[in-house]
């Protein structure tokens, strides 16, 4: 009669996270009498997974009916597998002993590898906005995947980027891994509608990569260009001066009119028009009663955009070129919410 052998026919088993792993084990004899135990790992630190004799193992079920007299199949199923379950599992036969059972023979072991999907990539940009022609960094992170092999790509508006660095951690063996990548992107004035995409491909995704996106609208600041012009005379003693604020982003903008350096009026951009590229235009105008001025007037349109230092544009209004009512101090009528008179 041959001495009992413990046979684990599978050297390795690959299971997707969340699924059930079947670990096969058979004995070649009914004796010696004694329980089978399953362990993860070997040596003194091994972890008990299942003990036929005693204990509660809610995730483990036996494949065959161990109550049958001639049963020699000690295969088990482990449910709801996670990456933390990865490792080498040993089926170990004990023989009955006094006072304790004695380890008799171990199977060769089955390596359980867990395929776990990466988490949805999270893309984050710089904390502060930057202006066109500047280079900004974006990071992409994804966690919890196994095995370690993974591919990460960066795109801007469908065009693959090449300036990025990627790390997969940890470097050594682990139950699961994380990927971290940093890409450098040069901003242009047309990037308000642009997107940066991080794409992660992994064996668990069956050719359907995961994507994380960041809108450059959260990152870019396009400073405005200013143009101050004098409109044709509306009335004999009134001049309309406009300040065209063009191609700015984001919308947060405050405009101040100065007359000879003195604040005349401050307003916040409200009814703006949007350009195709996502930037905004806005116009403010000032109705000047020239009869109130004896000397030339320097009108300044000062714009503070998105909390940045103010930019300004000035216009010299030649009072002498217009007829005046001497001594008149009559205010011109307001014709709009952003029309004001200078006295």
């Amino acid at each position: 009669e041959e001495e009992l052998q413990v046979i684990q026919p599978d050297k390795s088993v690959l299971v997707a996270a969340g699924e059930t792993a079947t670990l096969r084990c058979t004995a070649t004899s009914l004796i010696p009498v004694g329980p089978i135990q399953w362990f993860r790992g070997a040596g003194p630190g091994r972890e008990l997974i299942y003990n036929q004799k005693e204990g509660h193992f809610p995730r483990v079920t036996t494949v065959s009916d161990l109550t049958k007299r001639n049963n020699m199949d000690f295969s088990i199923r482990i449910g709801n597998i996670t990456p933390a379950d990865a490792g080498t599992y040993y089926c170990v036969k004990f023989r009955k002993g006094s006072p304790d059972d004695v380890e008799f023979k171990s199977g060769a072991g089955t390596e359980l590898s867990v395929r776990a999907k990466p988490s949805a990539p999270v893309v984050s940009g710089p904390a502060a906005r930057a202006t066109p022609q500047h280079t900004v960094s974006f990071t992409c992170e994804s966690h919890g995947f196994s095995p370690r092999d993974i591919t990460l790509k960066w795109f801007k508006n469908g065009n693959e980027l090449s300036d990025f660095q990627t790390n997969v951690d940890p470097v050594g063996e682990s139950v699961s891994y994380s990927i971290h990548s940093t890409a450098k992107v040069v901003l242009t004035r047309e990037d308000v509608h642009s997107q940066v995409i991080c794409e992660v491909a992994h064996v668990t995704l069956q050719g359907d990569p995961l994507r994380g996106t960041a809108n450059l609208s959260e990152t870019i600041r396009v400073p405005p260009t200013l143009e101050v012009t004098q409109q044709p005379v509306r009335a004999e003693n009134q001049v309309n001066v406009t300040c065209q604020v063009r191609k700015f982003y984001p919308q947060r903008l405050q405009l101040t009119w100065l007359e000879n350096g003195n604040v005349s009026r401050t307003e916040t951009a409200s009814t703006v028009t949007e350009n195709k590229d996502g930037t905004y235009n806005w116009m403010s105008w000032l109705l000047v009663n020239v009869s109130a001025h004896r000397d030339d007037v320097k009108l300044t349109c000062q714009v503070e955009h998105d909390g940045q230092p103010a930019v300004s544009k000035s216009h010299d209004l030649k009072v002498s070129a217009h007829p005046k009512e001497q001594g008149s101090n009559t205010a011109a009528e307001n014709t709009g919410s952003n029309e004001r008179n200078i006295y």
């Epitope: 009669e1 004796i31 009498v33 005693e54 109550t67 007299r69 002993g97 006094s98």
Partner: antibody, heavy 127, light 106 residues
């Protein structure tokens, strides 16, 4: 631990016999139990055993098909029913307890580590 | 099958060894059972190869190696005179017994 057998005596060939072993000082639900007999002038012969789970049983070829071993945990007894008695069934029948405390099924019904025996009950099959 | 000598003899105080050979190495446990007269209750003197039940004198010891078990009585006494049966099991027999060894103390 004590084991007490009863039910022996003079039996007629072809009739049935029921032997009872009452255990005390231990729980019969935790140990394999069995019957061993000794014919006059002969050695010990395994007859039948029942596992601690109460479901696995084994019989020697000489009695297979004629013997049934059962247990009653509440009464702490193990019963051997032997039908169609033959002259060669004559002998002293001993109840035996295995030493191994077993709480799982694949202890099966082995009696390879007997630590306690009953005093025996004599069975004579004769017409 | 288990094979043991039919008889051994010794003087009081001597050491006696009784062997029991299995036909293969798959007899993992051996027990030794003392019967002082035919039909009387056997007494287990050794089980689990080398374990001695409480109440059994320390002069009784056991060992097993491969397919052979040995009962050793160190300093045999007159009251040890009996028939000694070895017992074991294999995959098809829950219990098997040797034919018995008669120990005579001279």
């Amino acid at each position: 631990v004590t084991l007490d057998e009863s039910g022996g005596g003079l039996q007629t060939p072809g009739r049935a016999l029921s032997l009872v072993c009452r255990g005390s000082g231990f729980s019969i639900s935790s140990y394999n139990m069995g019957w061993v007999r000794q014919a006059p002038g002969k050695g010990l012969e395994f007859i039948a055993s029942i596992g601690s789970d109460g479901s696995s049983t084994h019989y020697a070829p000489a009695v297979k098909g004629r013997a049934t071993i059962t247990r009653d945990v509440g009464q702490s007894t193990v019963r051997l029913q032997l039908n169609n008695l033959r002259a060669e069934d004559t002998g002293t029948y001993f109840c035996a307890k295995d030493a191994y405390q077993c709480s799982y099924a694949t202890c099966n019904d082995y009696l390879d580590t007997i630590d306690a025996w009953g005093h025996g009950t004599e069975v004579i099959v004769s017409s | 099958a288990l094979t043991q000598p039919s008889s051994v003899s010794a003087n009081p105080g001597e050491t006696v060894k009784i062997t029991c050979s299995g036909d293969n190495s798959a007899h993992y446990y051996y027990g030794w059972y003392q019967q002082k007269s035919p039909g009387s209750a056997p007494v287990t003197v050794i089980y689990y190869n080398d374990k001695r039940p409480s109440g059994i004198p320390s002069r009784f010891s056991g060992s097993a190696s491969g397919s052979t078990a040995t009962l050793i009585i160190t300093g045999v006494q007159v009251e040890d005179e009996a028939v000694y049966f070895c017992g074991s099991a294999d995959s098809s027999n829950p219990a098997i017994f040797g034919a018995g060894t008669t120990l005579t103390v001279l």
